[in-house]
C-alpha cells in the first residue's frame, strides 16, 4: 500500500485495530454534479446488445437497492430488429464495494464486501480469428 | 429507510453519531467466488464497440486505482473491421461507492462518495430528430 | 402440452427435393425461434437450420447452405424445411425443436422425428 | 465450428452410482452449454441450460457445472430410468454444435 503520512487531526485509533476497523461518514459526497447518468438511461433499449433492469435488494446491504443488467438476446440485434446470429450479446461486469452489516442487523457495524454486478451489455464477435 | 431491529450484540453508537459515522472493518468479504470476471477481460477487443482501460489512481480514495473505460470510436466495429458512423459507441456508466479518506490522509477516517464510473461500452442507434 | 409433429419425409432420389413440415401446437407458436436438428442412423445430433421467432433471421450450416430452406407461417403454426439437391449423406431423422426464448440456441421441446432416406 | 469433444463415448454403471460425463469446447464457449438426454428411438430431451441450470421438472440428481473450455454433466445417484444417450451442445458460436453423445448404461 501506499504510506500515507498521518495527519496530527486525525481521530486516534490504535494499531491493532489498523487497517481493519475504520470510521466511515455515511454523509455521502456526490462527485457527479457535472455528469448526468439518466442520460445514458435509454441506452439500455437502443442498444444492439439491448438489456432488462432488474432490481437487487437486501436490507442487510448498503446500498440496499442494486440495479442488474440482463441481457435480452443471445444474439445481438440487426438494424432491423431482428436477431444476428453470427455476434453475442454479453454482460459487462464490474466488481463493486457494498457495505454489509455485521453482525446482521446492527444499524452502525459494516463490513466492506465486493460484488460483482452486470451493468449492461455489449455485442462481441464469438469467436476470435488467430492468424498464422 | 428499512426499519432493522437492533441486535443486543451490535457495537454500542451514541445517536448523535448515528448514522452519519459508522465502523467499516476492512477485511473484504468477496461474494465472486462462483464467476470469473477475468473471463470476460477480453469483450472490450471483441466488441462492436471496444473500448480501452485508463488507470486512476488516487492515493486519498479506496479503492486507490479504479478502471475507466474510454470508447475507441464514435462508431460502431462492422463485420469487416471498418467502422459504422450510423450507429454510436457509448460508454455505460454507474456509480459506485468509494471511501474518501476525510480529513486528508487519515488512515482509518473515511466518507462514503458516490462517483459515476464508465464500464465498458455498447452500440447504439442514434437517436434521429425530425425537424418539422 | 406442447406438441410437434413433423411429417413429409421419406425415400427420395439423390438430387430431388423434398419439404418437410412441422405443426407446432400448445404454445403461440409466432413468438418463438424454431430449428431443425438432425441425426443420421446410429450418429450423433447436427443443426440443419434456425430461424426466429418471426423468420426474419435465418441461419444455416455450410453443409446444407444453398441446398435447404427452413421458413415458417406463424398463421398456420407451421415450420417447414425445403430440401433441394439431396445427397446420401442428408439421410437422416429430421427433427423440428423449439427454442424457449424468440431466437433459436437451444431447444426445450422436440418433435418424434421424420425419416428422410436418400437412395437411388 | 466449435467442436465438442464428449467423454467418455460409453460407460456401464450400478444403480445409484455416481456418473460424470466431460464436455470440452474447441475454444471458450462462455457457459451456452446444454445438455439433453435422448432414450433409444425417442427425440432428445433437455436438461440443462446456460451450463448449470436445470431445467423445470428435471430431477435434481442431475446437475452441471464447468466453464470456459470444460464442462461436466453429473448424475449423483444413477437410476434405472436414467439409461439413455446424453449429449452436450454449445450455443455460443454458429453452427451450434454438438458432443458425439456419452451412452450409459447399467451394469
Known amino acids: 500500500g501506499i504510506a500515507i503520512p498521518r495527519n496530527s487531526g486525525c481521530p486516534n485509533s490504535e494499531d491493532k485495530n489498523f487497517p481493519r476497523t475504520v470510521m466511515v461518514n455515511l454523509n455521502i459526497h456526490n462527485r457527479n454534479t457535472s455528469t448526468n447518468p439518466k442520460r445514458s438511461s435509454d441506452y439500455y433499449n437502443r442498444s444492439t446488445s439491448p438489456w432488462n433492469l432488474h432490481r437487487n435488494e437486501d436490507p442487510e446491504r448498503y446500498p440496499s437497492v442494486i440495479w442488474e443488467a440482463k441481457c435480452r438476446h443471445l444474439g445481438c440485434v440487426k438494424a432491423d430488429g431482428n436477431v444476428d446470429y453470427h455476434m453475442n450479446s454479453v454482460p459487462i461486469q464490474q466488481e463493486i464495494l457494498v457495505l454489509r452489516r455485521e453482525p446482521r442487523h446492527c444499524p452502525n457495524s459494516f463490513r466492506l464486501e465486493k460484488i460483482l454486478v452486470s451493468v449492461g451489455c455489449t455485442c462481441v464477435t464469438p469467436i476470435v480469428h488467430h492468424v498464422a | 429507510g428499512i426499519a432493522i431491529p437492533r441486535n443486543s450484540g451490535c457495537p454500542n453508537s451514541e445517536d448523535k453519531n448515528f448514522p452519519r459515522t459508522v465502523m467499516v472493518n476492512l477485511n473484504i468479504h468477496n461474494r465472486n467466488t462462483s464467476t470469473n470476471p477475468k473471463r470476460s477481460s477480453d469483450y472490450y477487443n471483441r466488441s462492436t464497440s471496444p473500448w480501452n482501460l485508463h488507470r486512476n489512481e488516487d492515493p486519498e480514495r479506496y479503492p486507490s486505482v479504479i478502471w475507466e473505460a474510454k470508447c475507441r470510436h464514435l462508431g460502431c466495429v462492422k463485420a469487416d473491421g471498418n467502422v459504422d458512423y450510423h450507429m454510436n459507441s457509448v460508454p455505460i456508466q454507474q456509480e459506485i461507492l468509494v471511501l474518501r479518506r476525510e480529513p486528508r490522509h487519515c488512515p482509518n477516517s473515511f466518507r462514503l462518495e458516490k462517483i459515476l464510473v464508465s464500464v465498458g461500452c455498447t452500440c447504439v442507434t442514434p437517436i434521429v430528430h425530425h425537424v418539422a | 402440452e406442447v406438441q410437434l409433429v413433423e411429417s413429409g419425409g421419406g425415400v427420395v432420389q439423390p438430387g430431388r427435393s423434398l419439404r418437410l413440415s412441422c405443426a407446432a401446437s400448445?404454445?403461440?407458436?409466432?413468438?418463438?425461434?424454431m430449428s431443425w436438428v438432425r441425426q443420421a442412423p446410429g450418429k450423433g445430433l447436427e443443426l440443419v437450420a434456425i430461424i426466429n421467432h418471426n423468420g426474419g433471421s435465418t441461419f444455416y450450416p455450410d453443409s446444407v447452405k444453398g441446398r435447404f430452406t427452413i421458413s415458417r407461417d406463424n398463421s398456420k403454426n407451421t415450420l417447414y424445411l425445403q430440401m433441394n439437391s439431396l445427397r446420401a449423406e442428408d439421410t437422416a431423422v429430421y427433427y423440428c425443436?423449439?427454442?424457449?426464448?424468440?431466437?433459436?440456441?437451444?431447444?426445450?421441446?422436440w418433435g418424434q422425428g421424420t425419416l428422410v432416406t436418400v437412395s437411388s | 465450428d466449435i467442436q465438442m469433444t464428449q467423454s467418455p463415448s460409453s460407460l456401464s454403471a450400478s444403480v445409484g452410482d455416481r456418473v460424470t460425463i466431460t464436455c470440452q469446447a474447441s475454444e471458450d464457449i462462455y457457459d451456452r452449454l446444454a445438455w439433453y438426454q435422448q432414450k433409444p428411438g425417442k427425440a432428445p430431451k433437455l436438461l440443462i441450460s446456460?451450463?448449470?441450470s436445470l431445467e423445470t421438472g428435471v430431477p435434481s440428481r442431475f446437475s452441471g457445472s464447468g466453464s470456459g473450455t470444460d464442462y461436466t454433466f453429473t448424475i449423483s445417484s444413477l437410476q434405472p430410468e436414467d439409461i439413455a444417450t446424453y449429449y452436450c451442445q454449445q450455443y455460443w458460436s454458429v453452427p451450434w454444435t454438438f458432443g458425439g453423445g456419452t451412452k450409459v448404461e447399467i451394469k
Open positions: 425443436a423449439r427454442d424457449p426464448r424468440h431466437d433459436g440456441y437451444f431447444f426445450d421441446y
Open positions: 400448445g404454445f403461440t407458436f409466432s413468438t418463438y425461434g
Open positions: 446456460g451450463a448449470t
